[in-house]
């Protein structure tokens, strides 16, 4: 309830997360002409990044692109890039929608597509959809713990969500441990209505938010985070233009002498965490 | 760094074949694009042949249904094909890989009489 009598202020807050969990990736592998079941692991490292602000990344599916070089090679035939000859072609262009610069050739990219060629790391990204169901579909059971500290310097008042009684085994739950900071990505998901294994395909954003709503005054002081979750990005990813959340990264390697990469197009949760409320003191 | 060494330039009569190799070293040709370029007296070295890592490739018009780039890249080599030469074939022939860098042979000269 609103305290007239009180004098108010903002929250001022610092936010640190940290993501647990290990996931098995099964997928068919192709070396060499023979395809084999590849059993990759992946841990932390793995699969979150560090992002500036209150947010962290979960990556939850992924595109690779292996064994790229910088040289020079007929561009993938995505709709309107094919060629038929060299005027459709302009040296030194690079199309934003390209890989890489234009030679000015059109060139054969298969036996009967052709398109232009380009300088690139080669050969250029497929357009391949998300893999469904999602590689990293089990990153629905990791966990985060969200260490989160305030403050209220014009009542000189600092505290932090984690409590000293607290139990490093917990998972939060909105009724039976509302003040656990441990959270389990599924639940997360659940309490905001939505279906992670479905939003994992493509990536998307989901919301944290803390409030703090509290009292200062000493005979009914009262400071504790209430916990919230709600998708943040547009959910309709058949409506919308650029559907769920994706980056591009790569590993770069050297063999036989020449460098070269492996290109990941990377979906995945981005959780962004916002800390919002304020004290009260008369 | 890449090397690369051409051989089987020489002198043919119009209507004749030959056959070029470039033979790479520093590393596999199998990771990028190799070329064959061409220096006729007085004129700009111009793009023959290119083969791709995937296997496809390129022809300057002038040549195209003559001249035939393949690679064998067990032997780490790449070969032109010049079948019913003619005199306007005549220049030197440089083998050009790209990865990263532009690494070019030293040329081998291809002479043909009419």
């Known amino acids: 309830s609103d305290k007239l009598y009180q004098r108010k202020e903002p929250v001022i807050s610092s936010v640190h997360t940290k993501v647990k969990g290990i996931a098995e990736v099964t997928e068919n592998v192709t070396e060499g002409g023979v395809t084999k079941l590849g059993h990759s692991i992946f841990d932390t490292a793995d699969y979150t990044f560090p992002l500036q602000g209150n947010s962290f990344f979960v990556m939850t599916n992924y595109v690779k692109s292996e064994g790229q070089v910088q040289t020079l090679c007929p561009e993938y035939p995505r709709r309107g890039a094919q060629c038929s000859s060299d005027r459709r072609c302009k040296k030194g262009w690079m199309d934003p929608q390209s890989k890489g610069i234009q030679t000015g050739r059109c060139v054969p990219y298969d036996k009967t597509r052709k398109t232009c060629e380009v300088s690139a790391w080669c050969p250029t990204e497929e357009e391949k959809e998300a893999p469904r169901p999602a590689l990293l579909r089990s990153a629905e059971n990791f966990t985060v713990l969200i260490k989160n500290n305030i403050h209220f310097p014009g009542h000189n008042y600092t505290t932090r969500n984690i409590l000293p009684t607290m139990n490093g085994s917990c998972t939060f739950h909105k009724t039976w441990d509302p003040q656990c900071s441990i959270f389990r990505l599924g639940d997360i998901f659940q309490e905001a209505g939505e279906n992670f294994t479905e939003v994992a395909v493509q990536g998307g954003i989901m919301g944290i938010e803390i409030y703090w709503d509290c009292n200062l005054d000493s005979w009914s002081h009262h400071c504790r985070p209430r916990y919230s979750f709600r998708r943040l990005d547009d959910k309709n990813t058949d409506e919308s233009f650029v559907p769920g959340y994706n980056f591009r990264y790569a590993k770069y390697y050297k063999e036989n002498n020449v460098e070269k990469r492996t290109l990941i197009k990377a979906f995945g949760i981005r959780f962004d965490i916002l800390v919002f409320g304020t004290g009260g003191k008369f | 760094k890449v090397q690369l060494v051409e051989s089987g330039g020489g002198l043919v009569q119009a209507g004749g074949s030959l056959r070029l190799s470039c033979a790479a070293s520093?590393?596999?040709?199998?990771?990028?694009?190799m070329g064959w370029y061409r220096q006729a007296p007085g004129k700009p070295r111009e793009l023959v042949a290119r083969?791709?890592?995937?296997?496809?490739?390129w022809y300057e018009d002038s040549v195209k249904g003559r001249f035939t780039i393949s690679r064998d890249n067990a032997q780490n080599t790449v070969y032109l094909q010049m079948n019913s030469l003619k005199s306007e074939d005549t220049a030197v022939y440089y083998c050009?890989?790209?990865?990263?860098?532009?690494?070019w042979g030293q040329g081998t000269q291809v002479t043909v009489s009419s």
């Open positions: 050009h890989g790209r990865v990263r860098y532009d690494y």
């Open positions: 520093g590393s596999p040709i199998s990771s990028y694009a």
């Open positions: 083969i791709y890592t995937g296997g496809t490739a």
